[in-house]
């Protein structure tokens, strides 16, 4: 019995005065607690407790279930205990099959013994299966067997407490160990789409998938810079013991423009947190924005090819696209395709392929596109660069020599005189009159220039050259002169095309 200094309250004393008592099943248990301030006896086994306010605890016919710790407490809160084993060969273990383990922690298999003198108190696997090699345990006859540092691999492990009695192995009822995993990584979160574009009134629904080792993972949808609670629905699955998946679906049944913003799916566990975001843009109505990929004014040489290319954003998706020239719609020579195969793509490309353009094919080429909400168009002004062509070269009745040339860009006409039989005409002659004429063709057609010189200035036989040129090339026409007496006579004019 404990000894204390005089004057200080002392713990109660128990008779019999020993820490452990062994009785046989059917025998009497008689425990006496002596203390002037006696309060109660408490009996504990398998974490369950019973109380008795009598200072003498008497059990007339002891049963195995009377095995346990008997504690006497006084009014000062001081106590003393005795542990009683009720030896019953037919019931060697008291069992509570509640067996939960947390990964990396210890857990107690509650199978205290009714007889401390049996041997080889240990754990065994069910149906003769061996225990995992790394499973370590510590037996305690009064409490059970402590499994040290529970592993995830022990989940649903079936085991028995075991002792040797008279040379034979005796097993307890079976225990099934349920292991809760420890979080050793942050949750894995993903979102069904990274961005959403909707019209007002349409439903917004986005799903976040959270993956972790158990359903204890916390997750929520949050709106950035807002505390408002969002309505979400859950579905979840266990793909095996430590592979848990939750789908958290956020829905706004009728989205408004002010619902636009960034939504975050946030998940955390005891290890850490993870998040993923999705962006919602709500527009009051659909739109189309066209972006030319080349200048809308295009210059191209006669006979060459050109591609007219536009990119455009269309929401909702485009329904009709066409290329038009001179009120005629192209049925081929163009292609239209999405810029990406991404499900949320709203950007498209349209290309019109113009091949071997003729001078007469300049003009306005228009791309038109529409969706259920809007129409949009863009025009390309195509100019075809052509080498000058001399349309007329005549001697007029008033003695003027006139040269009319057409081309694009606007040709320049220069005049030269070659005396006698010289081949090279180098002496330039200033024109009397130069006019740009209105073409009767389309506004993007060739430009026509008329230039005149006075032939009276020429006093000798020779050749007059009319040379029309622009950035693309040059063409010449010639007037041959011969004098008969005082009369000047025009010999047939002819042209020489100079490359």
């Amino acid at each position: 019995q404990p000894s204390v200094s005089p004057g200080e309250p002392s713990p109660p004393s128990i008779h019999p005065g020993k820490s452990d008592l062994i009785v046989r099943v059917g025998d009497e248990i008689r425990l006496l607690c002596t203390d002037p301030g006696f309060v109660k006896w408490t009996f504990e086994i398998l974490d369950e407790t019973n109380e008795n306010k009598q200072n003498e605890w008497i059990t007339e016919k002891a049963e195995a279930t009377n095995t346990g710790k008997y504690t006497c407490t006084n009014k000062h809160g001081l106590s003393n205990s005795i542990y009683v084993f009720v030896r019953d060969p037919a019931k060697l273990f008291l069992v509570d099959r509640s067996l939960y383990g947390k990964e990396d922690n210890d857990t107690l298999v509650r199978c205290p013994l009714t007889d401390p003198e049996v041997t080889n108190y240990s754990l065994k696997g069910c149906q003769g299966k061996p225990l995992p090699k790394d499973l370590r345990f510590i037996p305690d006859p009064k409490a059970g067997i402590m499994i040290k540092s529970v592993k995830r691999a022990y989940h649903r492990l079936c085991l028995h407490c075991s002792v040797d009695q008279e040379g034979k192995s005796v097993l307890s009822e079976k225990f099934i160990l349920k292991v809760r995993p420890a979080f050793k990584a942050v949750p894995v979160v993903s979102v069904s789409k990274a961005s959403y574009l909707l019209r007002e009134g349409e439903e917004f629904t986005v799903t976040c998938t959270i993956k972790d080792v158990s359903s204890s993972v916390y997750s929520t949808w949050k709106r950035e810079n807002s505390q408002t609670k969002l309505q979400e629905k859950y579905n979840s699955w266990h793909h095996g013991d430590f592979n848990y998946e939750r789908q958290a679906t956020l829905t706004i049944s009728s989205a408004r423009v002010n619902d636009s913003g960034v939504f975050m799916c946030y998940a955390n566990n005891t290890f850490g947190s993870a998040n993923v975001t999705t962006t919602l843009e709500v527009v009051d109505k659909g739109f189309i924005n066209i972006f030319p990929m080349i200048n809308t004014t295009v210059f191209v040489n006669d006979g060459e090819n050109v591609d007219l290319i536009v990119e455009y954003e269309a929401f909702p998706k485009p329904e009709h696209q066409q290329w038009i020239y001179m009120n005629r719609t192209f049925t081929d020579k163009w292609e239209d395709y999405p810029k990406s195969e991404n499900e949320s793509n709203i950007r498209y490309v349209s290309e019109l392929h113009l091949t071997r353009l003729k001078g007469t094919e300049g003009g306005t080429y228009t791309f038109l596109v529409s969706n259920s909400d809007v129409n949009a168009a863009i025009a390309f002004n195509v100019y075809v660069n052509t080498k000058p062509e001399i349309l007329t070269y005549d001697r007029l009745v008033n003695g003027m020599l006139q040269c009319v040339a057409a081309g694009f860009p606007e040709p320049t006409i220069d005049w030269y005189f070659c005396p006698g039989t010289e081949q090279r005409c180098s002496a330039s002659v200033l024109p009397v009159d130069v006019q740009t004429l209105n073409s009767s063709g389309p506004p993007f057609g060739k430009l026509v220039v008329q230039s005149s010189i006075d032939s009276s200035a020429f006093k000798h036989n020779g050749t007059v050259e009319c040379k029309a040129y622009n950035d693309v090339g040059k063409t010449s026409a010639y007037f041959n002169f011969a004098f008969k007496g005082n009369n000047k006579e025009q010999i047939h004019p002819h042209t020489l095309f100079t490359p």
């Epitope: 974490d47 509640s98 947390k102 509650r110 649903r156 099934i176 158990s214 266990h238 848990y244």
Partner: antibody, heavy 116, light 107 residues
Framework: QVQLKESGPGLVQPSQTLSLTCTVS????????VHWVRQPPGKTLEWVGL???????SYNSALKSRLSISRDTSKSQVFLKMHSLQAEDTATYYC??????????WGHGTLVTVSS | DIQMTQSPASLSASLEEIVTITCKAS??????LSWYQQKPGKSPQLLIY???RLADGVPSRFSGSRSGTQYSLKISRPQVADSGIYYC?????????FGAGTKLELK
């Protein structure tokens, strides 16, 4: 002898917070799991949440955003707090002890009415 | 979450019949299934745990079985005292889930 007893207000105003206590005796909270289960009048049982023996908690998915379960082992008490109550939270709330044998012990339940 | 689909919702049986109540789990729950009986105004009482094992004090006319993810509670030759509502509960993983209940009336 194992016992569980629920206590708390019988009437809660809508949008207010419910606080319930489950006081246990005859066993230790560090050895057993204690669950909260509720049952609206005339309806089925609904699992609310659980306090694990090591102090961890698990919750019903539909309620977890407004639910919290805690404990005081020295007083052998488990607490349930649920905020933003609505009429559909009207129910008898039970606490129950689980071992591997199932929910072997139940409290008698406490009726909580959500009404103004 | 794991759904437990319980059927029938109610049944009326005579004392000579064998009553069968079933619960189907939406995914595998191993043997983590228990059955409870509840009488009006009372707390539920454990009948069967681990699919087949009878809780202390439960008469042997109650039995449990499993086929895949379908679990059954059988009451052979039910007695008047067996009337009440029966629930299954999966404890395979949190969140735990109950079946919707079966109301048993005895003629």
């Amino acid at each position: 002898q194992v016992q569980l007893k629920e206590s708390g207000p019988g009437l809660v105003q809508p949008s207010q917070t419910l606080s319930l206590t489950c006081t246990v005796s005859g066993f230790s909270l560090t050895s057993y799991l204690v669950h909260w289960v509720r049952q609206p009048p005339g309806k089925t049982l609904e699992w609310v949440g659980l306090m694990w023996n090591d102090g961890d908690t698990s919750y019903n998915s539909a309620l977890k955003s407004r639910l919290s379960i805690s404990r005081d082992t020295s007083k052998s008490q488990v607490f349930l707090k649920m905020h933003s109550l609505q009429a559909e939270d009207t129910a008898t709330y039970y606490c129950a002890r689980e071992s591997n044998l199932g929910f072997t012990y139940w409290g008698h339940g406490t009726l909580v009415t959500v009404s103004s | 979450d794991i759904q437990m689909t319980q059927s029938p919702a109610s049944l009326s049986a005579s004392l000579e019949e064998i009553v069968t109540i079933t619960c189907k789990a939406s995914q595998g729950i191993d043997d983590d299934l228990s059955w409870y009986q509840q009488k009006p105004g009372k707390s539920p009482q454990l009948l069967i745990y681990d699919v087949t094992r009878l809780a202390d004090g439960v008469p042997s006319r109650f039995s449990g079985s499993r086929s895949g993810t379908q679990y059954s509670l059988k009451i052979s030759r039910p007695q008047v005292a067996d009337s009440g509502i029966y629930y299954c509960l999966q404890s395979y993983s949190t969140p735990y889930t109950f079946g919707a209940g079966t109301k048993l009336e005895l003629k």
